[in-house]
Every structure is written in C-alpha cells, then in structure tokens.
Interface confidence: low
Amino acid sequence: YKLVCYYTSWSQYREGDGSCFPDALDRFLCTHIIYSFANISNDHIDTWEWNDVTLYGMLNTLKNRNPNLKTLLSVGGWNFGSQRFSKIASNTQSRRTFIKSVPPFLRTHGFDGLDLAWLYPGRRDKQHFTTLIKEMKAEFIKEAQPGKKQLLLSAALSAGKVTIDSSYDIAKISQHLDFISIMTYDFHGAWRGTTGHHSPLFRGQEDASPDRFSNTDYAVGYMLRLGAPASKLVMGIPTFGRSFTLASSETGVGAPISGPGIPGRFTKEAGTLAYYEICDFLRGATVHRILGQQVPYATKGNQWVGYDDQESVKSKVQYLKDRQLAGAMVWALDLDDFQGSFCGQDLRFPLTNAIKDALAAT
C-alpha cells in the first residue's frame, strides 16, 4: 500500500516546538512525501518560500538512506487561487509553457514527480483540468525517453460532491494520473452553525448535516462509481481536527455553535488544531466516540473538537483495504506529533505510524 504524506513549507514558521523542517521527517515512515506548495510565476513552476530550495534539499536527502522513498512537489494550494490556475490551464500557450517548465525544475531539485493541487477547478475548468493532466503526462513520458525514470503525476482532489461534479472528469483524469489523493476531510465546518465531525468515516445516525454526501464512505464510493480505479485512489486521513466554540450548554454532535474554535497555540488558526495541540487539549477534556461515524470528538469548556486518533485511523485503513484502494494519504506530517513530545507515547508521528502499522497488518 502507498502511504502518501504531505509536508507543508509554512510549518517552519510555527513557534517553538511547532516549527517543523523536512530534516525532522522520518525517512522510513511514508512511501511518498509531497512538499507543499510550489508557485507558478509567469507561467513557470517556481518556488514559494524564500528558502524553498534549501528545504527541497533537506527533504530529498532523506532518500539517501531510503532509496525507496519517493518525493513529489505539489503545485497550487489554497493561497494560489483557482482563477490563476484557470488562466494557465485554459490558455494553450500558458499551459505549454507551464508543462515544459516542470520536468527540469523537478529534476534540478531532486523530486520524483508533481502533485497538482488546483483547489478547485471551476465549473468551466473541467475540460482544461483534464487537458492539463493529459498533456503533463505526455510531457513526462517524452522527457523520460532517454532512459530516465519517468516522473510521477498525482492530483489532490476534493471529496465534496458538488466540487467532484463540477470540477473533475474522473474517468478521464484517472487514466493519466499515477495516483489520486482524495481529500476526505473538511466535510463539516463552522458555516453549518452546529458541531459536527469534519472527517467521518460513515454518515452515521448522528450526522446532522443536510445531505448524505459529507463522509468518507460516500466520497470514496462516488469516485469509484465515476470511474476512478481503486488501484489509483489514495484516501485522505487528517492529522488535524476542526474545532468549534459552543453556543449553549449542549455539547453533542449537532450542538449550536457561535463560530470556530479558539486558535491553537502553534497553528494559530481559528477552528483548526494540529494533532499535537489536540493531545494538549485532551488533558482535562471529555472524549466521546461518534459510533456510527467511527471517529472521536472532545469537549472542554465551550470548546469542541472533532479529530482522528489511533483507533479511528485504524478503522479508516481497514475500510480502504476492504475497498481495495491504493493506500492512505496524510495531511500533514507537520500536524502530527512530529517530535513525539506532546502525546505522551514517546513516539514520533503517532497517527502516521498507526496508519503505517495498519496498512502493513494482514
């Protein structure tokens, strides 16, 4: 099985024990590590952070001791902007320029492939996204002709039904991608006005959402139905939780909220907590399991957080094995307890290790 793990370059800027550089990663933990994110400047792939080149080097030296490890560079992301991607993909010249710029950039910096993180193609971009993938793959095949190892091509896709329907021609893009990471998290957010788990495995009786689509099982099943081969589908598992501020004394699933949860000490983003911050939060908190959804949540005071733990990730891995998927994807290594100092297990990357162990179990 594949274990595809994202690393985010901006994690270097977190304070103190939250700061994560690629040299802190475990070279034997994942089969693939994806560095997020690269930029596109003047239609050419480019660095984003001032020190990206240094960090690329740090990451790719991990392969010296584990030649089986593959590294990919992810281009795009939330801050890149969908319209910018649309501009490049929809214009033949821009697209060609971008595609041509990718192989030399990846080779120069020691990456084994490219991950496309267009978040998200609009309703009019579906065809352009397909064309971009098809032409990128053709370029990778051509570039590898002189006997080089062919560069890998993957894409991170939304798990939301509305986005899947409007953005992706699943059957077509699947033909050209080496694997597809489906982002089976962020199903529930503060916009709903109630508590709810952002990455439930199943819908469950507890789901107060207005639809039946907001769960991992539906998203995976839907992708398969649309023509994604199970052998290329990698299922996303988050090492972060989504938190809410409760608006009343109710604390269960579907309880009213006044907004996102208070920012974590290190990640400093309202409504989001890294797993290592959750381990801190759990001291003195009340933990519940949402039985039907097979995921936990915890409450403390007026704070509510839905997250994944070692038990829930094992359930998810069992599920992806039952579905005969290609493996698991983790967002993100730097949100796991990468130092092993927060979660009291004296183990670095406890969630990702639990996923790895479950994948390896017979």
């Epitope: 969908s82 319209q83 929809s90 214009n91 998200y120 009019r124 798990a159 916009w191 689509f213």
Partner: antibody, heavy 119, light 111 residues
Framework: QIQLVQSGPELKKPGETVKISCKAS????????MHWVKQTPGKGLKWMVW????????TYADDFKGRFAFSLETSASTAYLQINNLKNEDTATYFC????????????WGQGTLVTVSA | DIVLTQSPASLAVSLGQRATISCRAS??????????MHWYQQKPGQPPKLLIY???NLESGVPARFSGSGSGTDFTLNIHPVEEEDAATYYC?????????FGGGTKLEIK
C-alpha cells in the same frame, strides 16, 4: 479599498445602442469573476451574466442572449455591457457586481447605471 | 432554472420586534456542506448590500441582529431587534447552479 465605479445615466431611443462601463479598483481584476444584474424600476433583481475575467468568457442567463454583449478591457480593469437594438423593456438600472469568493454572493457592487429607453 | 419565492411580499414590524422573511427554492440549493443561499438589503437609490452569505454566515460589518438559517429548499432571514434603519427591501439569491436567481423581494416597513 475595493470599488466598482460605473458610467453615468443614459437616455436612448428605441433601436439605438448603449454601452456602459464598470471600472474596478483596489484588487487584481483577473482574480475575481464579474457579474451584471438588471433591476427594472420598482421591480426585483435579475442576474444577467457571469464573466470569467481571465478568459473574458461570458455565461448568460437565457433572457440576455442575443442583443446583449459583455466585454472586458483587462488592462483598464473595466467590464462593459452593450445593449443593441434597445427596447422600452430595457429601461432599468444595471449593476456590475463582484463575487466575494466561490459562489459566496456579491459583496461588491457598482453604484448602478440607469438606462432609459424612450421615443 | 431554480425559482426563489419570497414571503411575505411586504411586512410592517414594530421597532424592537422580530422580522422574519422566508425564501423557498424550487429545488435544493444545498450540497456537500454548503447551502448556496445569500441575503441582501437594498435601500432606494443604492445597490444591494450583502448581509448573509452561504445561508448563515454574517458578512463583515453587518450587525449581529441579522441572522440567516435553513438548508435544502427553505431559508429564513431574521432581524431582531428591528431598528429604524432596517427599513428596506430584502432579497434572497442562490448560487447553486447557473443561472443564479434572486427572489422577488420583501419590503420591510418599521411601525
């Protein structure tokens, strides 16, 4: 700050052509879609078109196919609405509006341009 | 096309009381996680002003006395307590699919 400034009121005769403008400032014009909305006197609002500001490609509501032309001058961060062969029922205030984000409603509006068609 | 029907067409509410405006869609405007319904306030001679986006999110700078709720086909805008300056016409609008459409409007009068 972000502003959409529209051209002034127009008085036209039936059969004539009018072209109104919407100049955007305070943001990168090609980063956000632009829309036009029609409001007839004392009546409600009617969505007319969505324009991809990067490609210039318009997507029309059925009622606004034919006599209506939408264009962009990207270098001037300006969107245009042209109505050909004007009819009395085109008398209305036309607003340009910018999407807040993906599908999140129109947070920025032009002040509106009143087009009066009268013989 | 999705038709949005607002009710009532007009209402008069006393200062400090609650105003409730409904918007019914001819088919669901909700999808995975989002309800693509927005509410606007319009005063004479002015463009509409976004109050609530994605059914329940308060636009920045809009007073907390405005709130939105609903999913699927039924949505509500509540104003409580109503103030003098709230006299205006209110519109719902969906962005679920093209063409985007507006409701017919509700005129709010303050007694």
């Amino acid at each position: 700050q972000i502003q959409l400034v529209q051209s002034g009121p127009e008085l036209k005769k039936p059969g004539e052509t009018v072209k109104i403008s919407c100049k955007a400032s305070g943001y990168t014009f090609t980063d956000y879609s632009m829309h036009w909305v029609k409001q007839t006197p004392g009546k409600g609002l009617k969505w007319m078109v969505w324009i991809n500001t990067e490609t210039g490609e318009p997507t029309y509501a059925d009622d606004f196919k034919g006599r209506f032309a939408f264009s962009l001058e990207t270098s001037a961060s300006t969107a245009y609405l042209q109505i050909n062969n004007l009819k009395n029922e085109d008398t209305a205030t036309y607003f340009c509006a910018r999407e807040y984000g993906n599908y999140e409603g129109f947070v920025y509006w032009g002040q509106g341009t009143l087009v009066t068609v009268s013989a | 096309d999705i038709v949005l029907t607002q009710s009532p067409a007009s209402l008069a509410v006393s200062l400090g009381q609650r105003a409730t405006i409904s918007c019914r869609a001819s088919k669901s405007v909700s999808t995975s996680g989002y309800s693509y319904m927005h509410w606007y306030q319009q005063k004479p001679g002015q463009p509409p002003k976004l109050l609530i986006y994605l059914a329940s999110n308060l636009e920045s700078g809009v007073p907390a006395r405005f709130s939105g709720s609903g999913s699927g086909t039924d949505f509500t805008l509540n104003i409580h307590p109503v103030e003098e300056e709230d006299a205006a016409t209110y519109y719902c609008q969906h962005s679920r699919e093209l063409p985007w459409t507006f409701g017919g409007g509700t005129k709010l009068e303050i007694k």
